[in-house]
């Protein structure tokens, strides 16, 4: 379990029930860095501190998850708690402008391809799906598969549909997807590679 995750959990568990409710509401409208999706409202509002910590880490990874949590705490006027959280994650204040992310600290699973290791983060964070489809069309994806992914209404659902075809892929097919990701969203791949 990462240090940042523990620090997020510690901060959220120290909120009163009313503060936790307020935290969730603010999380729905706090500006996010480019490339990050928002936790769906329905799922968010029913979560306890532990579930919310897990969701923050899966959606935003540990480092940005901690930074985002601190920003929401600031926006609640809980600056001391925000400071403690950032001190616990060794980030300091004002370190990086929006759009720059320090290496996340979550551990990757060994033996799996990058694509499989980071499935959840890719579903949540890939925004340029059409570009990926064009890169994979005719090499990895059939016309039917290509159209099926394109038909999905949102980027996360497009990515989920794309991942539904990956069990049949070999390592080389997955490498092609990784290469396409490197070309379309290099910052995202770099983030995940450092995790």
């Amino acid at each position: 379990m990462g240090r940042a995750r523990d620090a997020i959990l510690d901060a959220l568990e120290n909120l009163t029930a009313e503060e936790l409710k307020k935290f969730k509401l603010k999380l729905l409208s706090v500006p996010l860095r480019e490339g990050y999706g928002r936790i769906p409202r329905g799922a968010l509002l029913s979560m306890d501190a532990l579930d919310l910590t897990d969701k923050l880490v899966s959606f935003y990874l540990e480092t940005y998850g901690a930074e985002l949590t601190a920003n929401v705490l600031r926006d609640m006027g809980l600056q001391e708690m925000a400071g403690q959280l950032q001190a616990a994650t060794h980030q300091g204040s004002g370190a990086a402008p929006a759009g720059i992310q320090a290496p996340p600290q979550s551990a990757a699973k060994p033996g799996l391809h990058f694509i499989d290791q980071h499935r959840a983060a890719l579903i949540a964070r890939v925004t340029n799906v059409e570009w990926l489809l064009d890169a994979l069309y005719g090499k990895v994806l059939t016309d039917e598969q290509y159209q099926a992914v394109r038909a999905e209404p949102t980027n996360p659902s497009k990515m989920r549909k794309l991942f539904s075809f990956t069990p049949a892929w070999n390592w080389t097919c997955k490498d092609l997807l990784l290469q396409a990701l490197r070309e379309s969203q290099s910052y995202l791949v770099e983030d995940l590679e450092r995790s």
Epitope: K26, P31, R33, R74, S93, A98, G99
Partner: antibody, heavy 121, light 107 residues
Framework: QVQLQQPGAELVRPGASVILSCKAS????????ITWVKQRPGQGLEWIGN????????NSNQKFKDKATLTVDKSSSTAYMHLISPTSEDSAVYYC??????????????WGAGTTVTVSS | DIVMTQSQKFMSTSVGDRVTVTCKAS??????VAWYQQRPGQSPKPLIY???YRNSGVPDRFTGSGSGTDFTLTITNVQSEDLAEYFC?????????FGAGTKLELK
């Protein structure tokens, strides 16, 4: 009442840095984000960055990362924006605004009157 | 960056009319949109936040609506003091971005 006071105008030579000030009153300065916004004549609004006065944490627009530095002085409840090596492109009105922590929405409920910066030799 | 497109730079209206200002986001921003009014020589003034909530003190002739990518600001029974420029702003993602503005003019 809540106010953000800004000097009306600053004339600056090209390349000579300038520091714009924004004095807050009527609320707890350290609890609400201060945001800076640029408006060139006849053009739209551009977000430069936010600063949280309590701990000086900043979020900045990458476009302005080498152009503007945001700081605060808590003792005088004043926010500052340091414009670095200004050129004619930086001639604009610069507003400081407040994001009230009472609201969840990230909109700006109070605006200063703006400082008109003219970069000219 | 998320681009906020206000396709109409100018709109002509008469006192008492109903007018609709539109704003389109380049990607889904949920309801994380605000509207501002800027009169000539003044700073922007907040009208609407969270797409449809009026800021305190804003007359109820101003109504915001929309979600996802399409947003509207409707002014019913336009008054002479409403002749100004209107900007939309998204705060779903950094960098925060504004529309280019729509100027309301008398016919």
């Amino acid at each position: 009442q809540v106010q953000l006071q800004q000097p009306g105008a600053e004339l600056v030579r090209p390349g000579a840095s300038v520091i714009l000030s924004c004095k807050a009153s009527g609320y707890t300065f350290t609890s609400s984000w201060i945001t800076w916004v640029k408006q060139r004549p006849g053009q739209g609004l551009e977000w430069i960055g936010n600063i949280y006065p309590s701990d000086s944490y900043t979020n900045s627009n990458q476009k302005f990362k080498d152009k503007a530095t945001l700081t605060v002085d808590k003792s005088s409840s004043t926010a500052y924006m340091h414009l670095i090596s200004p050129t004619s492109e930086d001639s604009a009105v610069y507003y400081c605004t407040r994001k009230d922590f009472v609201y969840d929405a990230w909109y700006f409920d109070v605006w200063g009157a703006g400082t008109t910066v003219t970069v000219s030799s | 960056d998320i681009v906020m497109t206000q396709s109409q730079k100018f709109m002509s209206t008469s006192v008492g009319d109903r007018v609709t200002v539109t704003c389109k986001a380049s990607q889904n921003v949920g309801t994380n949109v605000a509207w501002y009014q800027q009169r000539p020589g003044q700073s922007p003034k907040p009208l609407i936040y969270s797409a449809s909530y009026r800021n305190s003190g804003v007359p109820d002739r101003f109504t915001g609506s929309g979600s996802g990518t399409d947003f509207t600001l409707t002014i019913t029974n336009v008054q002479s003091e409403d002749l100004a420029e209107y900007f939309c702003q998204q705060y779903n993602n950094y960098p925060l971005t504004f529309g280019a503005g729509t100027k309301l003019e008398l016919k």
